[in-house]
Every structure is written in structure tokens, then in C-alpha cells.
């Protein structure tokens, strides 16, 4: 039950996170005009990854796309790439995790396969979240650098009577959306990985004896000290020795050639 809850919650958190990453990537407010020196501007500038916009006091907003690839800063291209990779990985992760959900039955899918898929999607969510956080952080660092550079330019070469105030940009709403969304995707991914451990078939370290009413031979099974990776060959998720207890996932298994030594 706890495993299902952890997996379900991880999926929901990741879903919200990826939706946030997509929203942040599409948003125009990655950087907004710094109004510290000019709080009453009649022209407000803001920029996104794909276009820059100007909102005038009249209520008119004009946006212009960046119609060049080669003319854009390498850092901006890198941020775009990171965000897109994050979205693609997150989307694939979501797709994989839907089939991995314990509460969803798809044919006769084994629990080990579900565990596998849960881990895969978890890793994808973690990488997706890291991509988003990295992208947003790179952009934020670029803004901070440019902010201080333009501040330095503002106060130099002002010997004349005419002031040319350079537009400075500060953090826009998209950065905060991106950070939060990336964090949520990361947390969701971690939860999926934790859920994967609970889904994986357990193999105990002690020896067990299996009795079969149908046969006259007694099978002696050494439990051994098998490394428990979570992806063993025991596809039925059935403990070798169950001590009389059965889980709802366990179905009656019939002897096969592998049951006998």
C-alpha cells in the first residue's frame, strides 16, 4: 500500500513538475526590466527564451520572436537545449511511469517489469528536473552578470548633460516557476526510485524447503547469498519461503522444471 502511494505521489508530483517546466519554457518573463532606478516607466520590457516583449502604458503589448539562430548568445541556446531535453525526458518518463503504476494492470505484466519501468521513469524525472534547474540557473547567472555589467556602464561616461539609461534586466517569474518545477520533478523522480525498491521482488537469505503434495520427491532449495538487485529471475514476486503468509499479488504457481534440483 505504501509502495503504491509513494509511486502514485511520485507520478503526480512529477506530472506537476513537468507541466511547470513546459510552462516556464513557454513563458515570456524569463527576464524583466529592472525598475529600481525607474519605477514609473511608461514602457516595460521583458524577455523569454523565444521572444522579447514590450508592454506600453497604453495597454498595448508587442512581442517579437528571435528569428535568428546564429545571432543568439550561446548561453541562451544552451538554456533552450536544457529545457527541451528536460521536457522530452520528462514526457518519456511520464509515459513510462503510467505503465509502471502498480494500480494499473496491463495484461500480465510482471512486477519486476513494473519495478524496472518505475526506476527508469524515476531516473528520467531526476535528469529532467536537473536539466530544468540547470537551465534556469544558467540563465539566472547570465542575468546577474549582465546586470552588474550594465550597472557599471550606467555610472561611467556620464560626463555630458544627456543621460542614456541602459535597460537592466532582473529575474522574471519564469525563473521561479522553472526552479520550483525542476525541484518538484526531481522530488517526484526520487519518490519513483524509492517506490521501485518496494516493487522489486525480494529474495531472502535463508534456506527454505518446498513441499509439493503432488510429487513424491522433496526439493531442497538453497536460498544462497544471492545479490538482491531487485531484478532477479524470480518473476512471480513469490518468496521461496512464505511462512504461510500470502500477498494479494501471489497466485498459485505450479511446479516447473526450475523447481527441482
Amino acid at each position: 500500500m505504501a509502495v503504491t502511494a509513494c509511486q502514485g505521489l511520485g507520478f503526480v508530483v512529477s506530472l506537476i513538475g513537468i507541466a511547470g517546466i513546459i510552462a516556464a519554457t513557454c513563458m515570456d518573463q524569463w527576464s524583466t526590466q529592472d525598475l529600481y532606478n525607474n519605477p514609473v516607466t511608461a514602457v516595460f520590457n521583458y524577455q523569454g527564451l523565444w521572444r522579447s516583449c514590450v508592454r506600453e502604458s497604453s495597454g498595448f503589448t508587442e512581442c517579437r520572436g528571435y528569428f535568428t539562430l546564429l545571432g543568439l548568445p550561446a548561453m541562451l541556446q544552451a538554456v533552450r537545449a536544457l529545457m527541451i531535453v528536460g521536457i522530452v525526458l520528462g514526457a518519456i518518463g511520464l509515459l513510462v511511469s503510467i505503465f509502471a503504476l502498480k494500480c494499473i494492470r496491463i495484461g500480465s505484466m510482471e512486477d519486476s517489469a513494473k519495478a524496472n519501468m518505475t526506476l527508469t521513469s524515476g531516473i528520467m524525472f531526476i535528469v529532467s528536473g536537473l536539466c530544468a534547474i540547470a537551465g534556469v540557473s544558467v540563465f539566472a547567472n547570465m542575468l546577474v552578470t549582465n546586470f552588474w555589467m550594465s550597472t557599471a556602464n550606467m555610472y561611467t561616461g556620464m560626463g555630458g548633460m544627456v543621460q542614456t539609461v541602459q535597460t537592466r534586466y532582473t529575474f522574471g517569474a519564469a525563473l521561479f516557476v522553472g526552479w520550483v518545477a525542476g525541484g518538484l520533478t526531481l522530488i517526484g523522480g526520487v519518490m519513483m526510485c524509492i517506490a521501485c525498491r518496494g516493487l522489486a521482488p525480494e529474495e531472502t537469505n535463508y534456506k527454505a524447503v518446498s513441499y509439493h503434495a503432488s510429487g513424491h520427491s522433496v526439493a531442497y532449495k538453497p536460498g544462497g547469498f544471492k545479490a538482491s538487485t531487485g531484478f532477479g529471475s524470480n518473476t512471480k514476486n513469490k518468496k521461496i519461503y512464505d511462512g504461510g503468509a500470502r500477498t494479494e499479488d501471489e497466485v498459485q504457481s505450479y511446479p516447473s522444471k526450475h523447481d527441482y534440483v
Partner: antibody
């Protein structure tokens, strides 16, 4: 046809109050940012206040801040300027003007103006 | 506040001649975000309210004759009337549309010589 008609002007003593109105017609009033501009007896134009379409943002000339209040009633298509603590230097012809949507914040339509004289 | 300085204060030009009015702002009216200059020119005839002629430093308002043209960038702007007509006798004002307060120039009185 766009029409802006100001009213409410008159003679008032220093420290007195007046409320100017501007009735707008011929356009979707709620969409447009509106302004009050005054013209002094020396014929100088002086922007007084601006209110955006939804009424959420207002801007004032420093010398009138705290004394004048710009407001609008989009249902009545009317712009207002409440003027308190009037001074002699507030004597002017007050114009109501519309800020054009695509005119880079320029005032594309003006009313005929209403005269305010602050005198003791 | 942005100070708008117009020159000359008054100007007398012969009919059919070119009239040039200058306007200088104390701060740049250029917006890097959309590469536009936020300056407007108005014409005011006696007993009438001001009329918008030019916005964005160089764009003519609809209905304005093409003899009126605006130019300039940043802090220095010019209004040019290529061939003066009798009906152009008026006071011309430039205005900062970039930053509040939206300041006006003192005006230039244009007369016929």
C-alpha cells in the same frame, strides 16, 4: 466618432475642491488608458495623471500627488479627476485625453477642455 | 524628470518653404526592447486642443498630411514641414512618452514670414 467632453470646471478658492468629469463616446472606453493634461495660462502643457484601462494602475505628476485622484467608471464611460487642496498654480485649462493603443503612448484624442481658476 | 527642450521658441517661414523644429530630451527616449523612440509631436491651433501629428518619433498619425515628417533618435528629434501651408500656423509641442511624468516641450510658435 471619438468624442471626449469635459465638465466640472469653474472658479474655486485656494484649499477648495473640485471634481472634473470626462464623458467618452465612440470607442470601447474600458480598453483605453486615459489621461488628464492641463494647459497653464502661459500656454505650457503639463501632464497631470494617467489611469490604465482596467483602473488598476494610476500615475500622477509629483506636484499633484496626494491632492488629486484620477478614477474611471467603465460602465458609465466616464473619467474623473478629484482635485482637493487646490492651489493658485493649479489654474489651467484641463484636458481629458485618450492614449492611443498603437501610438507608442501618445495622446491621440483630446477633449475641448474645462477651465479651472483657483483664486481668492 | 525628463526635461524636453524645444528650439527655436518661435519660427517665421515663408509659404512653401521648409520649417524645422528641434526637440532635445535630457534622457534617451529610445527603448532597446523594441528599438523604438517614444517621442510624439502635437500641433495646437488657437482655441483648439492639441492634435497628434507624429508618434514614435517618426510615424505619422492617420490623416496627417505627408508634408509633416519626424526624425531623430535617443535624445535629439526633429519635426519637419517640407512645404509650409497657411493652415500650418500653430504652436508645436514635443512630448516624452517613455517615462512618467510624460513631459512636454515649451512649444515652438510657427508663423508665416
Amino acid at each position: 466618432e471619438v468624442m471626449l467632453v469635459e465638465s466640472g470646471g469653474g472658479v474655486v478658492q485656494p484649499g477648495g475642491s473640485l471634481r472634473l468629469s470626462c464623458a467618452a463616446s465612440g470607442f470601447t472606453f474600458s480598453t483605453y488608458t486615459m489621461s488628464w493634461v492641463r494647459q497653464t495660462p502661459e500656454k505650457r502643457l503639463e501632464w497631470v495623471a494617467t489611469i490604465v484601462g482596467g483602473g488598476g494602475y494610476t500615475y500622477y505628476l509629483d506636484s499633484v500627488k496626494g491632492r488629486f485622484t484620477i478614477s474611471r467608471d467603465n460602465a458609465k464611460n466616464t473619467l474623473y479627476l478629484q482635485m482637493n487642496s487646490l492651489r493658485t498654480e493649479d489654474t489651467a485649462l484641463y484636458y481629458c485625453a485618450r492614449m492611443g493603443l498603437t501610438q507608442r503612448n501618445a495622446l491621440d484624442y483630446w477633449g475641448q477642455g474645462t477651465l479651472i481658476t483657483v483664486s481668492s | 524628470d525628463i526635461v524636453m527642450t524645444q528650439s527655436p521658441d518661435s519660427l517665421a517661414v515663408s509659404l512653401g518653404e521648409r520649417a524645422t523644429i528641434n526637440c532635445k530630451s535630457s534622457q534617451s527616449l529610445f527603448n532597446s526592447g523594441n528599438q523604438k523612440n517614444y517621442l510624439a509631436w502635437y500641433q495646437q491651433k488657437p482655441g483648439q486642443p492639441p492634435k497628434l501629428l507624429i508618434y514614435g518619433a517618426s510615424t505619422r498619425e492617420s490623416g496627417v498630411p505627408d508634408r509633416f515628417s519626424g526624425s531623430g533618435f535617443g535624445t535629439d528629434f526633429t519635426l519637419t514641414i517640407s512645404s509650409l501651408q497657411a493652415e500650418d500656423v500653430a504652436v508645436y509641442y514635443c512630448q516624452n512618452d517613455h517615462t512618467y511624468p510624460l513631459t512636454f516641450g515649451a512649444g515652438t510658435k510657427l508663423e508665416i514670414k
